[in-house]
């Protein structure tokens, strides 16, 4: 009876996500058969989050709306370890929007999910950010310094990275 009600709950939770994510990849968390963490297929997972590399070229605002439709946001990078995981799935000759912007052009950078911007946990390329008109952040590869952030114009289409919390069922 207990297992039956647990299964019913799981099925109803899965139905919630089915509209945007018809397929989920789930793994058992720990030793308890009842705890599963899932990411939409073919998203990748790291710690408590799921990530999706969008290869369509869109403006920053459109990229954020696109992530939002999938129940996600443009990626908020909180640690060096998280960035190191993300870059494994990126192409060196491409640039990808982050969920970081400065809409007022006053160097008040803000993350899309309201995570406080911490100057100590940023990975700007040297000399960046460098232009008050460039109000959105990308991550890209420079041969001299590997992967890092750069400020660019928000209206210019780029690839992007979406991030969402893992789905627990």
């Amino acid at each position: 009876n207990f297992m039956y009600s647990k299964t019913v709950k799981r099925l109803s939770k899965l139905r919630e996500y089915q509209q945007y994510h018809p397929s989920l990849t789930c793994v058992m968390e720990g030793k308890d058969i009842e705890d599963w963490s899932c990411c939409p297929t073919p998203w990748t997972s790291f710690q408590s989050s799921c990530y999706f590399i969008s290869t369509g070229m869109q403006s920053w605002t459109k990229s954020q709306k696109n992530c939002s439709v999938m129940g996600a946001d443009l990626v908020v990078i909180n640690t060096r370890e998280e960035q190191d995981f993300i870059i494994q799935n990126l192409k060196r000759n491409s640039s990808y929007f982050l969920g970081l912007s400065d809409p007022g052009g006053r160097r008040h950078w803000q993350w899309v999910d309201q995570t406080p911007y911490n100057e100590n946990v940023t990975f700007w390329h040297s000399g960046e950010p460098n232009n008050l008109d460039e109000r959105c952040a990308i991550i890209n590869f420079r041969s001299s310094e590997e992967w890092g952030w750069n400020d660019i114009h928000c209206h210019v289409p780029q690839k992007s990275i979406c991030k969402m919390k893992k789905i627990y069922i």
Epitope: S59, S101, H153
Partner: antibody, heavy 121, light 111 residues
Framework: EVQLVESGGGLVKPGGSLRLSCAAS????????MSWVRQAPGKRLEWVAT????????YYPDSVKGRFTISRDNAKNSLYLQMNSLRAEDTAVYYC??????????????WGQGTTVTVSS | DIVLTQSPASLAVSPGQRATITCRAS??????????MHWYQQKPGQPPKLLIY???NLESGVPARFSGSGSGTDFTLTINPVEAEDTANYYC?????????FGGGTKVEIK
């Protein structure tokens, strides 16, 4: 007073080239993104090219990509548009315009008087 | 590309009356309360002149009889009251994404 003065327009045969110039004064030219916008007779305005303030980025619509090149010389307060492989549909008045960024986009707050380009055999 | 459709194509208004021009975008040009739609006036033989930026902000030096409103996909430029010197073409422009695009224009004539 902000002033933008275009020059270099004229009559050119299809396949020919032309270089437009825009002399800027009355503002710190190097601090602004600049664009070229054109208007064919009786048609809507059409964006042609943009160059960022720091000269780092140039952008073009597909209709001119590979044929037109925008450049700037901040020391001379000048903006340029090199137009190659010209076609009849490039016939228009070409305006130089200053960009002002606002939030995630921008608008054109000052425009030159325009220079006329006619492509005809 | 975002397509901007202006209506009407032309408009004849008596001095002292109100003129209303609409611009409809093929997709939203708004994001988090910012509306990236702008309006220009172009008189014959002259370059465009900025009137309104970000949907409702009056450019410095532009008479207060010009006003703008709207959000998402639907925007309006209002001239109230119209004066004889307002005879011109009026264009909307979006800048939320490249390429920046312009509406087809509305010709305003004074009766």
């Amino acid at each position: 007073e902000v002033q933008l003065v275009e020059s270099g327009g004229g009559l050119v045969k299809p396949g020919g080239s032309l270089r437009l110039s825009c002399a800027a004064s009355g503002f710190t030219f190097s601090s602004y993104g600049m664009s070229w916008v054109r208007q064919a007779p009786g048609k809507r305005l059409e964006w042609v090219a943009t160059i960022s303030s720091g000269d780092s980025y140039t952008y073009y619509p597909d209709s001119v990509k590979g044929r037109f090149t925008i450049s700037r010389d901040n020391a001379k307060n000048s903006l340029y548009l090199q137009m190659n492989s010209l076609r009849a549909e490039d016939t228009a008045v070409y305006y130089c315009a200053r960009q002002l960024y606002y939030s995630y986009g921008y608008y054109f707050d000052y425009w030159g008087q325009g220079t006329t380009v006619t492509v005809s055999s | 590309d975002i397509v901007l459709t202006q209506s009407p194509a032309s408009l004849a208004v008596s001095p002292g009356q109100r003129a209303t021009i609409t611009c409809r975008a093929s997709e939203s040009v708004s994001f988090h309360g910012t509306h990236l739609m702008h309006w220009y006036q172009q008189k014959p033989g002259q370059p465009p002149k900025l009137l309104i930026y970000a949907a409702s902000n009056l450019e410095s030096g532009v008479p207060a009889r010009f006003s703008g409103s709207g959000s998402g996909t639907d925007f309006t430029l209002t001239i109230n009251p119209v004066e004889a010197e307002d005879t011109a073409n009026y264009y909307c422009q979006q800048s939320i994404e490249d390429p920046p695009t312009f509406g087809g224009g509305t010709k305003v004539e004074i009766k």
